[in-house]
């Protein structure tokens, strides 16, 4: 049986007992700015190239033990959600990882900026097909981080980011508040906004759309064949990065505006229970859950 | 995300440091009437004081960025402050990343080509 999240983003006409998840995104490179990853995990081996980029702060606390599987946990899971063989969205997409988050999942605005600059320089040195940049991280509103995202977007790169897990207005966070970035909130199997402890998904007019972000099965760094369930707006953003990769692979000439329009067009409308959001934010928050197109050129999305 | 909105600062703090009239030995003064601004994260625990991104005006070349960074170091040294240039940006935004005392912000804001300065802050896996 298909994991609920893959079923949710798949158009009904492709659902069947013998469902083979879509195998697309092969013309697209997805950059992941996150923790280190276990690149030879069975789900993602050969699909993720670990770049030599690393810019992370030291871990907090004198008694912190650097355990490899924990250091790799967040990034490995997200790489699996984007392009994993069995539980991934865009099974044909190749990925490149940059380490901007330390073993505690913490990074800096400056490290992220240098990472974005690295991507731009790589793009200039060796132009490839369409690029998607996944930023599964958030900090406070940052003029400079938003400006860097804007510049990269204007260079033709599609940026997808997590709305944030603070149960707050996404406009107060970066890169979620950057207008050129596709900002993704998280919903669950009941199409409810995701609650995470006392907090939950961010909301508001800086969110572009929502995607599955609760109990998402993906590669676990605990072992080379392990899977684990994780939740958050990072997982939601990874779904949209995968969908974007598939759309761009099918139509490589799409502009950012056209891609955004398609993402919105193919989303499920008005399925989210808005009562979860603060009253003043309900009208501002898009009631959209991301989905793949029920493609007329089927072979492009479902090879 | 969500195109079409204007940049909203929210709780974001913008501290405009007025430029003093004296030129402080600069070869080029900032353009008349422009005031470089200082920004920092509104969420105090996420702030990383002591590291700053100095963002220069859009058309600034790499050589000018490097010169501006060196000028800041020289002027800071004259005041007895150690500074360290951690990275010079080019390709996306012109500017540089500097480790320095917050006491030097007023001086840094007066440098030629400076558009704004942002204190570094934390980001987190979501």
């Amino acid at each position: 049986s298909i994991p609920w999240n893959l079923e949710r983003i798949t158009p009904p006409r492709y659902r069947a007992d013998e469902y083979q998840p879509p195998d697309g995104g092969s013309l697209v490179e997805v950059y992941l700015l996150d923790t280190s990853i276990q690149s030879d995990h069975r789900e993602i081996e050969g699909r993720v190239m670990v770049t030599d980029f690393e810019n992370v702060p030291e871990e907090d606390g004198t008694r912190f033990h650097r355990q490899a599987s924990k250091c790799d946990s967040h990034g490995t899971h997200l790489a699996g959600v984007v392009s994993g063989r069995d539980a991934g969205v865009a099974k044909g997409a190749s990925m490149r990882s940059l380490r901007v988050l330390n073993c505690q999942g913490k990074g800096t605005v400056s490290g992220t900026l240098i990472g974005l600059e690295f991507i731009r320089k790589s793009q200039l040195v060796q132009p490839v097909g369409p690029l998607v940049v996944l930023l599964p991280l958030a900090g406070g509103y940052s003029r400079v981080l938003n400006a860097a995202c804007q510049r990269l977007a204007r260079a033709g790169v599609v940026l997808v980011t997590a709305a944030g897990n603070f149960r707050d207005d996404a406009c107060l966070y970066s890169p979620a508040s950057a207008p050129e970035v596709i900002t993704v909130g998280a919903t669950n199997a009941q199409d409810q906004p995701v609650t995470l402890g006392t907090l939950g998904t961010n909301f508001g007019r800086c969110v572009d759309l929502f995607a599955p972000g609760e109990d998402i099965i993906g590669a676990s760094s605990d072992c080379s064949t392990c899977f684990v369930s994780q939740s958050g707006t990072s997982q939601a953003a990874a779904h949209v990065a995968g969908i974007a990769a598939m759309m761009l692979s099918a139509e490589p000439e799409l502009t950012l505006a056209e891609l955004r329009q398609r993402l919105i067009h193919f989303s499920a409308k008005d399925v989210i229970n808005e009562a979860w959001f603060p009253e003043d934010q309900r009208v501002l928050t898009p009631n959209l859950v991301a989905a793949l197109p029920p493609s007329t050129h089927e072979n492009l999305y479902f090879q | 995300g969500a195109m079409g909105q204007e940049d909203e600062d929210g709780d974001y703090e913008e501290l405009v440091l007025a430029l003093r009239s004296e030129e402080d030995g600069l070869a080029e003064a900032p353009e008349h009437g422009t005031t470089a601004t200082f920004h920092r994260c509104a969420k105090d625990p996420w702030r990383l004081p002591g590291t700053y991104v100095v963002v220069l005006k859009e058309e600034t070349h790499l050589s000018q960025s490097e010169r501006t960074a060196r000028r800041l170091q020289a002027q800071a040294a004259r005041r007895g402050y150690l500074t360290k240039i951690l990275h010079v940006f080019h390709g996306l935004l012109p500017g540089f990343l500097v480790k320095m005392s917050g006491d030097l912000l007023e001086l840094a804001l007066k440098l030629p080509h400076v558009d704004y300065i942002e204190e570094d802050s934390s980001v987190f896996a979501q």
Partner: antibody
């Protein structure tokens, strides 16, 4: 191009150990693990286990647990498979292959166990 | 881990099509999209012909195709040629390991 080159044939006595090497080239060594597969004369392929070139973690087939050790040396992009307490039925060709995907194979190393 | 079930031998004439089946369980073939097919000529290392059920690596003839239904995967070779005579093995992920089929000897008559 991507290549896996294995060490030469070995003849061992029952009870001894054998260590086969597999040198990788033409790709980023740590992006894939190494699988080890053996084939007894006239028999089919048998998966023995996998070793991570990224962090050294291993995943052994239950049948070989306790008798096999798989390791990697990232400085030389080489993987090793050591099989202990050899028996005559361990006589086989031992192959290394790239990752779980096993898309590229070594040429094979013949190990003969005979008294 | 018991091997996946393949027919011991299959015969075909040049130009014909043949299909080799590979039957597993809901814990291996049925559960994963990672079924591969390997061709092995005598005295040679195996060569991957199909991966992830139906994908062909570059350089492999489009006469080779793969599919899966439930717990059974299939390899089809169309327009059979003399050089296709070889042993063919399927493999699949299991929850923790890998498992091969027992192998099928293809004879081109």
């Amino acid at each position: 191009q991507v290549q896996l080159v294995q060490s030469g044939a070995e003849v061992k006595k029952p009870g001894a150990s054998v260590k086969v090497s597999c040198k990788a080239s033409g790709y980023s060594f740590t992006s894939y693990g190494i699988s080890w597969v053996r084939q007894a004369p006239g028999q089919g392929l048998e998966w023995m286990g996998w070793v991570s070139a990224y962090n050294g973690n291993t995943n052994y087939a239950q049948k070989f647990q306790g008798r096999v050790t798989m390791t990697t040396d990232t400085s030389t992009s080489t993987a090793y498979m050591e099989l202990r307490s050899l028996r005559s039925d361990d006589t086989a060709v031992y192959y290394c292959a790239r990752g779980y995907v096993m898309d590229v194979w070594g040429q094979g190393t013949t190990v003969t166990v005979s008294s | 881990q018991s091997a996946l079930t393949q027919p011991a031998s299959v015969f075909g004439s040049p130009g014909q099509s043949i299909t080799i089946s590979c039957t597993g369980t809901s814990s291996d073939v049925g559960a994963y999209n990672s079924v591969s097919w390997y061709q092995q000529h005598p005295g040679k290392a195996p060569k991957r012909m199909i991966y992830e059920v139906s994908n062909r690596p570059s350089g492999v003839s489009n006469r080779f195709s793969g599919s899966k239904s439930g717990n059974t995967a299939s390899l089809t070779i169309s327009g059979l040629q003399a050089e296709d005579e070889a042993d063919y093995y399927c493999s699949s992920y299991t929850s923790t390991n890998m498992v091969f089929g027992g192998g099928t000897k293809l004879t081109v008559l």
